[in-house]
Interface confidence: low
């Protein structure tokens, strides 16, 4: 049974040219986090943090994405095109997959960095839970579906 919840930074805004930290936190579960995937609004992967293997930043983002803090991600040199949804996907064992959503609005430098309507939603429960059935074929450490497709 999936008892955990994902907390995210919710709706955030940042200045064009600046940087922002995308952060999710999994609570209320003892499940082991085997991997965290960070995806952009079009489902492109920005980065993966695997418990055993460390970080893999996808080359399309390597100039502008820094791993951390923790399991979070720092997005730098923001452009207006970075506005949109970001998803953290926590692959856990034995629970399955938890998913959180963050909406980032990149503002022109002339606009105040944090508008009130974004500020009020900081740290909402990011609410999308997905459960995948896993095939544990490598020593029972759990984690990802046995598939060649998207995760």
């Amino acid at each position: 049974m999936m008892t955990g919840t994902i907390e995210t930074t919710g709706n955030i805004s940042a200045k064009k040219g600046g940087s922002v930290i995308l952060q999710c936190h999994l609570s209320s579960t003892m499940a082991q986090v085997t991997q965290v995937n960070w995806e952009q609004h079009d489902h492109s992967l920005l980065a993966i943090r695997n418990a055993e293997l460390g970080w893999h930043i996808y080359p399309a983002f390597k100039d502008r994405v820094a791993p951390g803090p923790g399991l979070g991600l720092t997005l730098q040199s923001l452009t207006m095109n970075d506005t949109g949804e970001y998803f953290c996907t926590y692959h856990t064992y034995p629970d399955g997959t938890y998913r959180g959503r963050i909406f980032l609005e990149v503002l022109e430098s002339s606009v105040a960095e944090h508008s009130a309507r974004f500020q009020e939603n900081l740290y909402f429960q990011g609410l999308e839970h997905h459960h995948h059935h896993h095939h544990h074929h490598h020593g029972g450490s759990g984690g990802l579906p046995e598939t060649g497709g998207d995760r």
Epitope: E39, Q40, D42, H43, S44, L45, L46, N50, E52, L53, G54, W55, H56, I57, Y58, P59, A60, K62, P67, H137, H138, G139, L144, G148, D150, R151
Partner: antibody, heavy 122, light 111 residues
């Protein structure tokens, strides 16, 4: 069916250029990175570079920078590699390969073209 | 000289298990690099067998398994069959860096 269909074999003179194409079908072309990997006769695999069509982001291995141009035409779901200043050691089979995951280029390749033999000979 | 070192050849009899190693020899492809394994039959394109060290794409036999300890990743093929005879390549994709292939290992199925 997801597949990558490559252009036919080429014979080129040293110093010239060659352009190989790779037409994708069966999936959303723009979303997946396409890499180019070559294999000289009797030798191993060598990653040359790749492109993520959605971002038009190109990554080229250091060894090939300045000699390789990788492009993609989203309207025809086709990726291209052009190699200039050809020399005899560029004789190889050139493969295009699709990234396992959307958004990446150069991680793990789940779909491969059949390869294009490029022979460089005077 | 590849930054990934593989044995040139390994062999085994049908039904046996064989293991092919792949050791990262540079900091870039050290312990925090993702590894994949490819099978290539003569005259054919490579086929992805294992990715991210130990995950199998759909359609790949569960006789193929991957593991990693420190800088060395391993591909184990159990219940060896004649059709497993091929070249096997490991590859690494380190954080924010280029894909690297090992020089390849020729697997011979005896008898």
């Amino acid at each position: 069916e997801v597949q990558l269909v490559q252009s036919g074999a080429e014979v080129k003179k040293p110093g010239s250029s060659v352009k190989v194409s790779c037409k994708a079908s069966g999936y959303t072309f723009a979303s997946y990175g396409i890499s180019w990997v070559r294999q000289a006769p009797g030798q191993g695999l060598e990653w040359m570079g790749g492109i993520t069509p959605f971002f038009n982001r190109v990554d080229v291995a250091e060894k090939f920078q300045g000699r390789v141009t990788i492009t993609a035409d989203k309207s025809t779901s086709t990726a291209y590699i052009e190699l200039s200043s050809l020399r005899s050691e560029d004789t190889a089979v050139y493969y295009c390969a699709r990234d396992l995951r959307r958004g990446g280029v150069g991680d793990a390749f789940d779909i491969w073209g059949r390869g294009t033999l490029v022979t460089v000979s005077s | 000289q590849s930054a990934l070192t593989q044995p040139r050849s390994v062999s085994g009899s049908p039904g046996q298990s064989v293991t092919i190693s792949c050791t990262g020899t540079s900091p870039d492809v050290g312990s925090h690099a993702y590894r994949s394994w490819y099978q290539q039959h003569p005259g054919k394109a490579p086929k992805l067998m294992i990715y991210e060290v130990s995950y199998r794409p759909s359609g790949v036999s569960n006789r193929f398994s991957g593991s990693k300890s420190g800088n060395t990743a391993s591909l184990t093929i159990s219940g060896l069959q004649a059709e497993d005879e091929a070249d096997y390549y490991c590859s690494s994709y380190p954080p924010s860096s280029a894909t690297v292939f090992g020089a390849g290992t020729k697997l011979t199925v005896l008898g």
